[in-house]
């Protein structure tokens, strides 16, 4: 029998340029009579144009919703009711071609054409895009708070905040032709639930979403987003009611930046430069295409690309890359944002060099990508270290910590976390190396102690990049480096003259002069440690709650012993900057470290002094007894302590701790404590120092109180942020 044809609604969005009209400010106000009359005329013209083509039979409805510069640009949407089997045949490209063809056919015609009665439409200025019913609904919900802004070349336009009576607003932004718009979003409140979405077109088309941000992101307090061209839309959706705008938006047109480079690398190892997407650290724009050609000086070298919080992965089934597509020597890889460092190593097989292409495959983009490039020796990619094939990084081998996710850096070790004697491969503990007493059969542990040696897992790297064999040579009163750099920055780690309480757990004034108390509204929240004249280190998880993220809330006390009283040695500071480790992950506690910049430098005294920071190669030997200090609870679930408490804890081998915590212990963690429980850190100690005393008598920061199962529970250790695992970031920030 007869079967009715199934019809489907196909939605299109677009814009057209009118050459014989000019844009005026009146047209930005939807309530103005100018807007109403222009809309009526433009709507009539649009309907007539569509119905003049073979699309006319499918015409359902249309709307002109906005105007812009150029001389006059009309922004519209329309719906066609199409037989289902024709759906794919009427793509936006086909519809655009049909409408352009119609416009061209009447350009020189003297016959009266209804849609040309008032408007001279530029065929070249017609754009048709795919849209959906959902997109139109989203657009309509913003029309009560719709702002159009044109921003000229060289201008930076600060956008007027949203109308708080509305639940949603749209900023329609336009810049000069041939330029691209750069939008800057700065969150100004610590906490909010507002949502902002940026689009690469005039309206909220889901398929042209560049990015969306939500809720006063602390990870990205400032976001810069690039459109692919001169048009952009920003949609705001209200979160919690607030009288203050939780963000500031500004926009500026910028010129297209070429992203093509030819480089010839020097005959040396390590990083030689940086490649980045245009306007880094801005988000890369939709339709970004970068092509970098690097020439390597010899086939002995491979090319290394070091990424920060971004990795390259093979993508199955030719699915589009959502975070950037890379082609390297005809291999297709997809970018992936991760909270880890990563390196891609490219073996070089021909002198022709290597071409690296980066493309944004979809309109959805993300933070700009920056990559350091350099050479590595193909026959020995990681001198003195282990090449972790999982992430391309060079990691210490046989140091007792599985730095590589597959643990291969700790496999097949003759001597793990010890020194291997040359004579017979016996293992001796590291503190015995270069201590003036031969422990190996023929004394190989005391050889080469006064000269440079190849860098390795436990060697110390001097400032001139040479390495010394003696483990932990920092600040021991004897220069071991030729340049003396192992004895620089040594005004640290000394306790003040203190009257110790023998056998007690209460600390005395000046005993732990680096100890900090981090307080909010007079209440102790976390511990910390002074590491430089203006820097205190603590745990990132202290700022986990949005309400704790603002620097203005915090006061840092140094030289403090008692919480309920002040004494003359005590000083307090406000916080001018708060930096969480960029790889910090709340769920796993990985990279649990933060740095607070004090509002003024400390004046050192017997009660206020920094602790020494270890070098990356510093070895805190498992078994060593170290100390934790803090005002944390004296029992699980109890109130914080009034007096600064101290307790000695033993450092635990990583594998043993990892077993206890079911392999949740990462290489940036360190374990200490007792199986019997009893001695441990507790709530309120977080961020406080775990310090170990070197033979020189100086105290080095080994860890920060991070997490653990309960407090002092039997069979569970305390887990600390391993300072040697995050030291490069600390040094980068502090210096």
């Amino acid at each position: 029998g007869y079967k009715a044809e199934v019809m489907v609604s196909q939605v299109y969005s677009g814009s057209l340029r009118v050459l014989n009209r000019h844009f005026s400010q009146d047209l930005t106000r939807r309530e103005s009579s100018a807007f109403r009359s222009e809309t009526a005329k433009a709507q009539k013209m649009l309907k007539e144009l569509i119905t003049s083509t073979r699309l006319g039979t499918y015409y359902n409805s249309s709307s002109v919703y906005s105007f812009g510069e150029g001389p006059l640009t009309c922004f519209f949407w329309f719906i066609l009711q199409i037989p289902e089997h024709r759906r794919l045949m009427l793509s936006p490209e086909v519809v655009q071609a049909l409408l352009v063809e119609e416009l061209l056919s009447t350009v020189n015609s003297s016959a009266a054409v209804p849609y040309r009665a008032e408007y001279e439409v530029d065929p070249e200025g017609l754009v048709i895009l795919e849209a959906s019913v959902k997109d139109i609904a989203a657009l309509n919900s913003t029309l009560g708070c719709y702002r159009y802004s044109y921003v000229g070349q060289g201008q930076v336009l600060r956008l007027k905040g949203p109308d708080h009576l509305a639940s949603s607003c749209l900023w329609h932004l336009q810049g000069p032709k041939d330029l691209m718009l750069k939008l800057r979003l700065e969150w100004t409140l610590a906490e909010c639930r507002d949502r902002l979405a940026m689009y690469d077109v005039a309206g909220p088309l889901e398929k042209r979403l560049i990015t969306s941000v939500y809720g006063c992101s602390r990870q990205e307090p400032v976001v810069e987003v690039l459109a692919s061209g001169a048009i952009m839309a920003v949609v705001w959706k209200k979160g919690l009611h607030s009288y203050y705008d939780p963000f500031v938006l500004s926009v500026q047109p910028v010129v297209f930046q070429a992203c093509e480079v030819n480089l010839t690398l020097d005959n040396r190892l390590d990083s030689q430069g940086v490649l980045s997407t245009p306007y880094f650290p801005s988000y890369y724009s939709p339709q970004t295409h970068c092509s970098w050609h690097l020439t390597v000086p010899s086939l002995d070298y491979g090319l290394a690309l070091w990424f920060d919080a971004y990795a390259l992965r093979r993508q199955k089934y030719d699915l589009p890359c959502t975070q950037g597509q890379w082609t390297i020597q005809n291999r297709r890889l997809c970018g992936l944002r991760i909270l880890q460092p990563y390196a891609e190593r490219i073996p070089v097989v021909a002198t022709a060099g290597i071409t690296i292409n980066f493309t944004s495959q979809i309109s959805l983009t993300g933070p700009g990508v920056r990559v350091h490039y350099g050479l590595y020796n193909q026959s020995d990619p990681c001198p003195g270290e282990f090449l972790c094939s999982v992430n391309g990084l060079c990691v210490p081998a046989c140091d007792g910590v599985k730095d590589c996710p597959n643990g291969l850096d700790e496999r097949n070790c003759v001597c793990r976390a010890t020194f291997q004697c040359k004579e017979d491969s016996t293992c001796i503990s590291l503190p015995k190396v270069c201590d003036g007493q031969p422990d190996c059969l023929n004394g190989s542990d005391e050889e080469q102690c006064q000269e440079g040696v190849p860098c390795g897992t436990f060697t110390f790297q001097c400032e001139d990049r040479s390495c010394v064999k003696k483990p932990n040579p920092q600040c021991d009163g004897r220069p071991d480096c030729r340049d003396g750099s192992d004895e620089e920055h040594c005004d640290c780690g000394l306790q003040g003259p203190s009257s110790r309480i023998v056998g007690g757990a209460v600390s005395s004034e000046g005993e732990w002069p680096w100890q900090a108390s981090l307080q909010v509204r007079g209440r102790h929240i976390c511990g910390g440690a002074l590491i430089a004249d203006r820097w205190v280190i603590t745990a990132a998880h202290c700022f986990q709650e949005d309400s704790m993220a603002s620097t203005v809330l915090w006061t840092v006390f140094l030289g403090k012993v008692w919480q309920n009283s002040r004494w003359p040695g005590e000083v307090s500071f406000k916080v001018s900057r708060l930096l969480l480790h960029p790889y910090h992950e709340e769920d796993s506690h990985d990279y649990d470290v933060a740095l607070l910049q004090l509002d003024h430098p400390v004046v050192r005294s017997a009660a206020v002094r920094p602790v020494c920071l270890p070098a990356r190669s510093h070895f805190f030997e498992p078994g060593l007894h170290c100390w934790i200090t803090g005002w944390g609870a004296l029992r699980e679930g109890g109130p914080i302590s009034n007096a600064l408490q101290k307790v000695d804890v033993q450092l635990i081998p990583q594998d043993l701790c990892s077993e206890v915590y079911r392999y949740q212990v990462t290489p940036r963690m360190l374990c200490a404590g007792y199986r019997k429980g009893k001695k441990d850190a507790c709530q309120g100690d977080s961020g406080g120092p775990l310090v170990c005393k070197a033979l020189s008598g100086r105290w080095f920061l080994a860890g920060l109180v991070s997490w653990g199962l309960g407090c002092g529970r039997p069979n569970y250790f305390g887990v600390y942020t391993r300072i040697t695992g995050v030291i490069s970031w600390i040094q980068q920030v502090v210096t």
Epitope: P622, G623, H625, A672, G673, Y674, K676
Partner: antibody, heavy 120, light 107 residues
């Protein structure tokens, strides 16, 4: 390569004293708690005493309390057991043993043992 | 002091047999218990710690279980080198105390 070597054993008359020593090598002695355990001929094991890594804490079996003293010299990597007022029932092989990490406190490594005979 | 009672005091078994030794504490000791193996004229060797944890290098045929007051050492399939005396040791409280030992002999 952990090695524990006991010395100082022998035959002694009841009421007299004897000092046992244990020389440790192959590990950082000052990090670990140390123990003495004994075994009378043909009998089971009996825990005698232990000392913490820094010498600040000692514990004894009731049978030796007040007569035996455990001590250590971390600079010489040596553990000692001073045995006074010896009795016939103190006759045994004496083992020195090293704890694993204090967080675990198991007797991981043992010396080969030294015989002490208390007899008139 | 906490008393540790081991049973049986001796047992005869053949190669390939499954052997179970039990240890009972006179009070709750959580899981603070280790198992040691001693061969004639030799020092004891740690097999199991914290009741169920196998010391590294010890064959997986040895296993420990239990907590509170009742503990078990199981040898899944007895091998010729397993004929020895086995002791449990509580380290929950001072003074530490051993069980009286279980001698495993060839049938």
């Amino acid at each position: 390569q952990v090695q524990l070597v006991e010395s100082g054993g022998g035959v002694v008359q009841p009421g007299r004293s004897l000092r046992l020593s244990c020389a440790a090598s192959g590990f950082t002695f000052s990090y670990f708690g140390m123990h003495w355990v004994r075994q009378a001929p043909g009998k089971g094991l009996e825990w005698v005493a232990d000392i913490s890594y820094d010498g600040s804490d000692e514990n004894y079996a009731d049978s030796v309390k007040g007569r035996f003293t455990i001590s250590r010299d971390n600079s010489k990597n040596t553990l000692s057991l001073q045995m006074n007022s010896l009795r016939a029932e103190d006759t045994a092989v004496y083992y020195c043993a090293k704890e694993t990490y204090q967080s675990l406190m198991y007797l991981e490594y043992w010396g080969q043992g030294i015989l002490v005979t208390v007899s008139s | 002091a906490i008393q540790m009672t081991q049973s049986p005091s001796s047992l005869s078994a053949s190669v390939g047999d499954r052997v179970t030794i039990t240890c009972r504490a006179s009070q709750d000791i959580r899981n603070d218990l280790g198992w040691y193996q001693q061969k004639p004229g030799k020092a004891p060797k740690l097999l199991i710690y914290t009741a169920p944890s196998l010391q590294s290098g010890v064959p997986s045929r040895f296993s420990g279980s239990g907590s509170g007051t009742d503990f078990t050492l199981t040898i899944g399939s007895l091998q010729p080198e397993d004929f020895a005396t086995y002791y449990c040791l509580q380290d929950y409280n001072y003074p530490w105390t051993f069980g009286q030992g279980t001698k495993v002999e060839i049938k």
